[in-house]
Interface confidence: medium
Amino acid sequence: EVEKTACPSGKKAREIDESLIFYKKWELEACVDAALLATQMDRVNAIPFTYEQLDVLKHKLDELYPQGYPESVIQHLGYLFLKMSPEDIRKWNVTSLETLKALLEVNKGHEMSPQVATLIDRFVKGRGQLDKDTLDTLTAFYPGYLCSLSPEELSSVPPSSIWAVRPQDLDTCDPRQLDVLYPKARLAFQNMNGSEYFVKIQSFLGGAPTEDLKALSQQNVSMDLATFMKLRTDAVLPLTVAEVQKLLGPHVEGLKAEERHRPVRDWILRQRQDDLDTLGLGLQGGIPNGYLVLDLSMQEALS
């Protein structure tokens, strides 16, 4: 709390300008009118205030707007945003994407802070869903943003927004998140032709079910091993050797290097050794010839 002291003669601020950088903290408190500050917030960012001085300016705004700042002030906060706490931000109603961009720009190059996370949460909740423009903006500033959302939060992403997602935006997503995003991506890209469709859907395939992988195997897609290794194990297990061979195309040779890792290891255990031998890769661990394979899940379904 800054002590209340009278403003020295001749020091009363008539406008927010560079002369204020030479004011001590108590002089800023005494000589800068909060209403003047609020109307000239756009100037603050261009003036090289120290963070100590910005603390004083924030204090003045807090006194003027105890219920939370209006958007006209928020959009011009600039570096003053770094002084806001999540509690401050929860009082705001941010509706403009331009305001969001302006504040994210201030934090650019730094990790997502609790302030930024709160700001984004307030903005998205205010909009009701993660529309394409918002997602575009957020992933531009924070490529990992999408993967920081819970599956429940991701369910509010409309399929049209999926067009804004780049492969690197999904790098840190786990299978539960991809389970939610994949059907949306499938819907978003459904009108594309085979090869174009595969390029777009590839990053989302960690959420694809078996039947979709079977369908892709009929389209000469030549899936690379890195993508194959990210597929759901339960979706890969029912694929036949022939289907995996078609799915991977020339990349099938890479299975040998991955034979001890999931999902390849588990898939090998489900295949007949005879069938694996047809690949000519020396994959071992399949079901020996002459053994009967009982699909117990099918048996349970029938009984």
């Epitope: 090289p48 205030f49 120290t50 963070y51 100590e52 570096y79 770094l82 190059g109 730094h110």
Partner: nanobody, 115 residues
Framework: EVQLVESGGGLIQPGGSLRLSCAAS????????MGWVRQAPGKGLEWVST???????YYANFVKGRFTISRDNSKNTLYLQMNSLRAEDTAVYYC?????????WGQGTLVTVSS
């Protein structure tokens, strides 16, 4: 974190010149602007000059025309060229950087103007 180390202070006669340096290290990419603040014996801190990352400069009235602030980004160094020094410029001069998300200070360098 940003570390600041000043140098260049000393004893100088009135009317003389001196150049102070401030070497910055650490997370210098987070620096928004830098400046010089001084504290005369028995007095409070007073701002002297500021330079922004784009090179805009600001001076207190009492040093305008005599002092020049500059920075060499390739060396991560801030300078204060002080000409026409007066007895009242005697003070400890501190380098100060405003960097994400706080203000950093150097340990100060003493300038004594005396005949």
């Amino acid at each position: 974190e940003v570390q600041l180390v000043e140098s260049g202070g000393g004893l100088i006669q009135p009317g003389g010149s001196l150049r102070l340096s401030c070497a910055a290290s650490g997370n210098i990419g987070s620096i928004r602007h830098m400046g010089w603040v001084r504290q005369a014996p028995g007095k409070g801190l007073e701002w002297v000059s500021t330079i922004t990352t784009v090179g805009t400069t600001y001076y207190a009235n009492f040093v305008k025309g005599r002092f020049t602030i500059s920075r060499d980004n390739s060396k991560n160094t801030l300078y204060l060229q002080m000409n026409s020094l007066r007895a009242e410029d005697t003070a400890v001069y501190y380098c100060r950087a405003t960097a994400h998300p706080t203000d950093y200070w150097g340990q100060g360098t003493l300038v004594t103007v005396s005949s």
